[in-house]
C-alpha cells in the first residue's frame, strides 16, 4: 500500500508511523490526513514548511524524535493543527518563528524538551492555546512572561517536575492583567521552599495542584501561608505514592488555608494520625467538595455536623473503623476502596442523594432503610464489591432510588420477601455475582420503572427460570448469563415488551427454542453463546421477532447429524443475524468436530422401505 510502512488506522484520516527509523517526514501519506503519529523516529531537524504536504493535520505526535533544531515556520502550513506533541526531544535551537502558522493550536506538549525558561519560549502568538504542558523540564523561575496576557484561552498550565524553588509577587503579575479565572496550574514535584506572601493575592484560578513540593511540614505551612488571598475553585495538596517527604501532620498544618477562598479541596497520600481531625480541617468547613485520597487516618468520627460540604470523597484511605458520618449538607458521598472499617455503621446525612460505598469489603447487618443513611432523598446507591449484606428491610424511606448496585457482594435473605417492592422509581439494578439463589417468584415485584437488570452469576431453584419478571414492563436490558440455567418458563419474558438486549450466555441450555421470545417486539440482541446447544427442542422453529439484529450462538455444542438437519438449516436461514458465525462449530459427530456449521453441507437421504 502507498502509505507503508506506516499503519493506516482510519483510511485517509489517521496514520501511525511510530518507530520506523524515518529520517525525514514521509511523503506517501495522503494529503487528507488529520492525525499523524511520527513518534520514535530519528528526525533530528525540522526545517521550514516540514509539513506542507499535510494541510489538514489536526493532531501531530513528534514524541522522542531526537529533534534538536526547529526552524522558523516548521509548521507553517498547519492552520488546522489543534494538538502538537514534542515530548522527549532534546531541543537546543528553537527559532523565534518555530511555531508560526499554528493559528488553531489548542494543546502544546513540550514535556522533557530541555526547556530552561518560559521567557524565551516563542509561543506568545498562540492565542488559541488552551493547554500548555512543559512538565519535566529545567525551568527555575515561575515568572509568567508578559506574552501570557495574549494567551487568553489558556486553561491548563502544567509546570510539574521542574526546578522552581521560589515564587515571588512579580512572577504572577501578568495574571492580574488577564481574566484567567479558568486557569488550572500544576506545580507538583517542584522543590518549592518559599512563596512570598501576597504572591497569589487577588488571583483567581480554576485549579491549583501542589503535590510532593515540600521537604518538611514547616516549609509546607509557610508556603500555604504564602497562598493567602488566592481564590481557587479546586485545590489539590499532598504527595504522590512514590514521592513521600512529609512525615506526620499536626493540627495546624492547614491553618493557612483559612486565608484562601476554596470551593473544592483534595488531599492525597498523607499520613494523618491525629486524635482530632476536626482541627485539621477547620479552615475547610465551608468548601463544597472535600476529598481525601490515600490518606491514613486514625479516626474520622470527628467530622462535624456543621461542615457545609456537599460532596465528600474518601478513597483508598485507611480507617480504624467505619467513620461516624453526620453531615447536614452532604449531597454526594463517595467512600470507596478503603481499608480498616469492616462493618458499616449508620450515617446521618439528611441531604444525601448519591452514595457510593463500593469496594470496601464492608458487611451490613441490615439493608436497606432510610435509617441506615439518615436520608429519604437517596437516588443512587452503590454497595458493590463488599462483604455480607443482609437484606432485612424493603428500602423503607428510600423510594426515590433510581440506581442500585450490589454486584460482587454477598446478599443474604434475598428470596424471603419482595425486597424491592417499594422501589417504583428504580431504573438500574445490578445483583450480579451476589450468591443469590432465586427461589421466590416475587423477587422483582414492584420494579415498575426498571430498565436495566443485571443478575449474572447467580442461580435458580432447579436451574429453571420462572415467571419472575412480570412487573418489569419497562425493562430494556436483561443479563442472565452464568446462572447455570437449563430450562425456562415459556412465558418468562411475556411482559417484557420493551426488552432490547437479552444475555443468556454461559448457561447450560442444551436446546434452542424461539417460543419464549415471541412476545419481545423490541428485542435487538440475543446472546446464547457458551451454552451446550445441540439442537432445537421443537420441530417447528418459529422466527425470532423481526426487530432482532444480532443473534450470538457461538461456542455451543452443535450436533451436525442428519436428525438435526432442519435445525441446522434453520441456523443457516438466520445467517444475517448471526454474530461471529465462523465461531459456530460442530461438536458432534467426531468426524465433523470443529467444522464451521455454516459451511456444512448435510445431505440426508430418507430410507425407503
Amino acid at each position: 500500500e502507498s502509505w507503508e510502512p506506516c499503519v493506516e488506522v482510519v483510511p485517509n484520516i489517521t496514520y501511525q508511523c511510530m518507530e520506523l527509523k524515518f529520517y525525514k517526514i514521509p511523503d506517501n501519506i495522503p494529503f487528507s490526513t488529520k492525525n499523524l503519529d511520527l513518534s520514535f523516529n530519528p528526525l533530528r531537524h525540522l526545517g521550514s514548511y516540514s509539513f506542507l504536504r499535510f494541510p489538514e493535520l489536526q493532531v501531530l505526535d513528534l514524541s522522542r524524535c531526537e529533534i534538536q533544531t526547529i526552524e522558523d515556520g516548521a509548521y507553517q502550513s498547519l492552520s488546522h493543527l489543534s494538538t502538537l506533541i514534542l515530548t522527549g526531544n532534546p531541543i537546543q535551537s528553537l527559532a523565534l518563528g518555530a511555531f508560526s502558522g499554528l493559528s488553531s493550536l489548542q494543546k502544546l506538549v513540550a514535556v522533557e524538551t530541555n526547556l530552561a525558561s518560559l521567557e524565551n519560549f516563542p509561543i506568545g502568538h498562540l492565542k488559541t492555546l488552551k493547554e500548555l504542558n512543559v512538565a519535566h523540564n529545567l525551568i527555575q523561575s515561575f515568572k509568567l512572561p508578559e506574552y501570557f496576557s495574549n494567551l487568553t484561552n489558556l486553561e491548563h498550565l502544567d509546570l510539574s517536575s521542574n526546578k522552581i524553588q521560589n515564587i515571588y509577587c512579580k512572577d504572577l503579575q501578568v495574571l492580574h492583567q488577564m481574566p484567567l479565572s479558568n486557569l488550572s496550574l500544576d506545580l507538583s514535584l517542584n522543590p518549592i521552599n518559599f512563596i512570598q506572601p501576597g504572591a497569589f493575592k487577588e488571583i483567581r484560578l480554576h485549579k491549583l495542584t501542589l503535590r510532593s513540593n515540600f521537604d518538611d511540614l514547616n516549609v509546607m505551612k509557610t508556603c500555604i501561608q504564602g497562598l493567602a488571598g488566592l481564590e481557587v475553585h479546586r485545590l489539590v495538596l499532598g504527595e504522590f505514592r512514590n514521592e513521600r517527604n512529609l512525615e506526620e501532620f499536626d493540627k495546624s498544618s492547614l491553618e493557612g488555608l483559612c486565608n484562601l477562598t476554596i470551593e473544592e479541596f483534595r488531599l492525597t497520600y498523607l499520613d494523618c494520625y491525629l486524635d482530632n481531625i476536626i482541627d485539621l480541617f477547620n479552615c475547610l468547613a465551608n468548601v463544597s467538595s472535600f476529598s481525601l485520597v490515600s490518606v491514613n487516618i486514625k479516626r474520622v468520627e470527628d467530622f462535624s455536623y456543621n461542615f457545609r460540604w456537599q460532596h465528600l470523597e474518601l478513597v483508598n484511605c485507611k480507617f480504624e473503623q467505619f467513620p461516624t458520618l453526620e453531615l447536614k449538607s452532604l449531597k454526594r458521598l463517595t467512600f470507596t476502596a478503603n481499608k480498616g472499617g469492616n462493618a458499616f455503621s449508620e450515617v446521618d446525612l439528611p441531604s444525601l442523594e448519591f452514595l457510593d460505598l463500593s469496594r470496601n469489603g464492608l458487611s451490613f447487618k441490615g439493608c436497606c432503610s432510610q435509617s441506615d443513611f439518615g436520608t429519604t432523598s437517596l437516588k443512587y446507591l452503590d454497595l458493590s464489591f463488599n462483604d455480607v449484606i443482609t437484606m432485612s428491610s424493603n428500602f423503607l424511606g428510600l423510594e426515590q432510588l433510581e440506581h442500585l448496585d450490589f454486584q460482587h457482594s454477598n446478599l443474604k435473605q434475598m428470596s424471603q420477601f419482595s425486597v424491592f417492592l417499594s422501589l417504583r422509581n428504580l431504573i438500574y439494578l445490578d445483583i450480579s455475582h451476589t450468591h443469590t439463589r432465586v427461589a421466590f417468584n416475587g423477587i422483582f415485584d414492584g420494579l415498575l420503572s426498571l430498565k436495566v437488570l443485571k443478575m449474572a452469576g447467580n442461580s435458580f431453584q432447579e436451574n429453571f427460570l420462572p415467571d419472575i419478571f412480570t412487573d418489569l414492563k419497562n425493562l430494556t436490558f436483561l443479563d442472565l448469563s452464568q446462572c447455570q440455567l437449563e430450562q425456562l418458563s415459556p412465558t418468562a419474558f411475556d411482559t417484557l415488551n420493551k426488552l432490547q438486549v437479552l444475555n443468556m450466555s454461559h448457561n447450560n441450555f442444551f436446546s434452542l427454542d424461539t417460543f419464549p421470545y415471541k412476545c419481545l417486539p423490541s428485542l435487538q440482541v440475543l446472546d446464547y453463546s457458551l451454552n451446550h446447544i445441540m439442537t432445537s427442542n421443537n420441530q417447528e422453529l418459529q422466527h425470532f421477532p423481526s426487530s432482532l439484529a444480532f443473534l450470538n450462538l457461538t461456542q455451543n455444542d452443535f450436533a451436525c447429524t442428519c436428525e438435526h438437519q432442519s435445525f441446522l438449516q434453520w441456523i443457516k436461514d438466520q445467517r444475517q443475524l448471526l454474530v461471529e458465525a465462523e465461531r459456530m462449530e460442530c461438536a458432534t459427530p467426531s468426524d465433523k468436530q470443529g467444522m464451521p456449521v455454516l459451511s456444512l453441507n448435510i445431505t440426508c437421504q430418507m430410507n425407503k422401505t
Epitope: 447536614k328 450515617v347 441490615g366 432503610s369 435509617s371 439518615g374 432485612s392 428491610s393 424493603n394
Partner: antibody, heavy 118, light 107 residues
Framework: QVQLQESGPGLVKPSDTLSLTCAVS?????????WHWIRQPPGKGLEWMGY???????DFNPSLKTRITISRDTSKNQFSLKLSSVTAVDTAVYYC???????????WGQGTLVTVSS | EIVLTQSPDFQSVTPKEKVTITCRAS??????LHWYQQKPDQSPKLLIK???HAISGVPSRFSGSGSGTDFTLTINSLEAEDAATYYC?????????FGGGTKVEIK
C-alpha cells in the same frame, strides 16, 4: 407519627426476671432504625441499656451484658426487654425509644415504673 | 465509656433570666452531643442535636454551643414552662451515656 408504649408488671421479686414489652405504632420495627431501652432510677439520671436493630442485631451496655436480652416480634410490631437476676437497684422507670440515624432519641415511650421488692 | 459531667446540678432562676448549663465530656466527642428536657412524670424530649442544631418545634430561646469536650445549653429568657431537668447525651461512641442532669426551678 411514631408512638411507643411500654407495658409489663410493675412489681418484680428480687432474683426474678423483669420482662417488659414496647408496642410501636406508626413505623414497622423491621423496616428501619434501632429500638432501645433506657432506664431511670427514681430521682436519678438516665442509663442506656441496649437496642435491637431493624435487622435483628442486638447490642447492650457492657454493665448489663450478662443479664439483658432484647427480642422482637415484627408481626405484632413490638420489642421486648428481659433483665434477669434483678435486685433493688434495678428499680426504675423503664423507657423504650427509637434512635435516629444520628445517635440521639427523638421518640420515647411514656415510661413504666418497675419496682423490685419482695 | 465516655463520662459526661453536668453543672450545676440545680439552678433556681427568675423568669426572663438567662440560664446556662454546661456539660463536659471525659474525651473529645466533636459535636456529637445532644440535649433533652424532662418535666416531672414525663419522658425526655429532644431539644438540640449535634451541640447546636435546634429540633423543629423547640422555642428559639433554647440554643446550644460547643465542640470537643465543653458544651453549653442556653435558655435565653426563661419562661415558667421551662421548669424541668435538662440532660446532655453523647452520641460519639457506644455505650451511649447521659449527663447527671441539671434541675432548673422557677423562683
Amino acid at each position: 407519627q411514631v408512638q411507643l408504649q411500654e407495658s409489663g408488671p410493675g412489681l418484680v421479686k428480687p432474683s426474678d426476671t423483669l420482662s417488659l414489652t414496647c408496642a410501636v405504632s406508626g413505623y414497622p420495627i423491621g423496616g428501619g432504625y434501632s429500638w432501645h431501652w433506657i432506664r431511670q432510677p427514681p430521682g436519678k439520671g438516665l442509663e442506656w441499656m441496649g437496642y435491637i436493630h431493624y435487622s435483628g442485631y442486638t447490642d447492650f451496655n457492657p454493665s448489663l451484658k450478662t443479664r439483658i436480652t432484647i427480642s422482637r416480634d415484627t408481626s405484632k410490631n413490638q420489642f421486648s426487654l428481659k433483665l434477669s437476676s434483678v435486685t433493688a437497684v434495678d428499680t426504675a422507670v423503664y423507657y423504650c425509644a427509637r434512635k435516629d440515624s444520628g445517635n440521639y432519641f427523638p421518640y420515647w415511650g411514656q415510661g413504666t415504673l418497675v419496682t423490685v421488692s419482695s | 465509656e465516655i463520662v459526661l459531667t453536668q453543672s450545676p446540678d440545680f439552678q433556681s432562676v427568675t423568669p426572663k433570666e438567662k440560664v446556662t448549663i454546661t456539660c463536659r465530656a471525659s474525651q473529645s466527642i466533636s459535636d456529637h452531643l445532644h440535649w433533652y428536657q424532662q418535666k416531672p412524670d414525663q419522658s425526655p424530649k429532644l431539644l438540640i442535636k449535634y451541640a447546636s442544631h435546634a429540633i423543629s418545634g423547640v422555642p428559639s430561646r433554647f440554643s446550644g454551643s460547643g465542640s470537643g469536650t465543653d458544651f453549653t445549653l442556653t435558655i435565653n429568657s426563661l419562661e415558667a414552662e421551662d421548669a424541668a431537668t435538662y440532660y446532655c447525651q453523647q452520641g460519639h461512641s457506644f455505650p451511649l451515656t447521659f449527663g447527671g442532669g441539671t434541675k432548673v426551678e422557677i423562683k
